[in-house]
């Protein structure tokens, strides 16, 4: 899957664009908004009717090296009485993000963009019921 | 990917940190996956905290299309199919990395950007406090 060129006719390639070898692109990994602290509500994972746990995966050849994955705690959902109701399902919600992968080939190193699927949390769904003859 | 030669003494000159700027292959590894969440599952409709998906498009970004979730209700759907306002539908947010064209409009020059997206919604039971 290639990154699309700017296809809009009103986009003129500026003179200031850096020269880039064919088949590659220049990527600055100094992240925009890196230090922006976002106000993500904490403890949603334990108050949800489809609660989840977090696991940190770490890979020194990936940037960012730390990726957090969620896993649903239950098969069913937690009802008003605090009991698991297995007529409902806790299901993972996933989102794609980009990472940079570093690859070693002998004494050379190369970099590859990669899409990673991250499980961000869980939601409670009503299963579609099918009656089999 | 694009191969970059390392120093002659490469076994000892391993740099654990990533350089600030790298040259990467235009091909993105790992994805012919479906990036439209409406097609990948119908959880957004069947959840007890259902959500609508809004298309956010920006040609200066890769991916140019990102789907943002917005909880449909304030409360959650109960067993009778009614909204129960003793519970809250809340967005699950995630920081993701995208590519931002830098300088703007350049076809092959990007910078990583961190953005916060609402991916879906979940139903939470609030902790109750009684104010004197």
């Amino acid at each position: 899957r290639k990154i699309p060129k700017v296809g809009h006719t009103f986009f003129q390639k500026p003179e200031s664009c850096p020269p880039v070898p064919g088949g590659s692109m220049k990527l600055d990994i100094g992240i925009i908004n890196e230090n922006q602290r976002v106000s993500m509500s904490r403890n949603i994972e334990s108050r949800s009717t489809s609660p989840w746990n977090y696991t940190v995966t770490w890979d020194p050849n990936r940037y960012p090296s730390e990726v957090v994955q969620a896993q649903c705690r239950n098969l069913g959902c937690i009802n008003a009485q605090g009991k698991e109701d297995i007529s409902m399902n806790s299901v993972p919600i996933q989102q794609e993000t980009l990472v940079v992968r570093r690859k070693h080939q002998g004494c050379s190193v190369s970099f590859q963009l990669e899409k990673v699927l991250v499980t961000v949390g869980c939601t409670c769904v009503t299963p579609v019921i099918h009656h089999v003859q | 990917g694009i191969t970059i030669p390392r120093n002659p003494g490469c076994p000892n000159s391993e740099d654990k940190n990533f350089p600030r700027t790298v040259m990467v292959n235009l091909n993105i590894h790992n994805r012919n996956t479906n990036t439209n969440p409406k097609r990948s599952s119908d959880y957004y409709n069947r959840s007890t905290s259902p959500w609508n998906l809004h298309r956010n498009e920006d040609p200066e970004r890769y991916p140019s299309v990102i789907w943002e979730a917005k909880c449909r209700h304030l409360g959650c759907i109960n067993a009778d199919g009614n909204v129960d306002y003793h519970m809250n539908s809340v967005p699950i947010q995630q920081e993701i990395l995208v590519l931002r064209r830098e300088p703007p409009h350049c076809p092959n020059s990007f910078r990583l950007e961190k953005i916060l997206v609402s991916v879906g919604c979940t139903c939470v039971t609030p902790i109750v406090h009684h104010v004197a």
Partner: nanobody
């Protein structure tokens, strides 16, 4: 700790109007939603109306839709419930609530009596 200051309530004739107000204060908190439930004698506490803070969306119980209007004052962290065409079945103790910290905490105010009677 969140404090809720309410005003309004009292006795009103059928077909009349009433305005309830509720303001949240105390420390630093981010509002998720504010609204009202009500409790009539011998009945369970039922939802009346609420407003989501992030986008101002309002929500109503079917029994009050078209007669009650909820609005907010962002600067004062306050909500107002304008009740028109009141009926005897609207008689109840009205409780204001505030949801904070992404909807994870709910603060209940003390009730205010609304009586619709001739």
């Amino acid at each position: 700790e969140v404090q809720l200051v309410k005003s309004g309530g009292g006795l009103v004739q059928p077909g009349g109007s009433l305005r309830l107000s509720c303001a949240a204060s105390g420390g630093t908190f981010s509002l998720f939603a504010m609204g009202w439930f009500r409790e009539a004698p011998g009945k369970e506490r039922e939802f009346v109306a609420a407003i989501r803070w992030s986008d101002g969306s309002s929500y109503y119980a079917d029994s009050v839709k078209g007669r009650f209007t909820i609005s907010r004052d962002n600067a004062k962290n306050a909500v107002h419930l304008q009740s028109n065409s009141l009926k005897s079945e609207d008689t109840a103790v009205y409780y204001c609530y505030a949801d904070v910290q992404g909807g994870l905490h709910r603060y209940w105010g003390q009730g205010t009596q609304v009586t619709v009677s001739s």
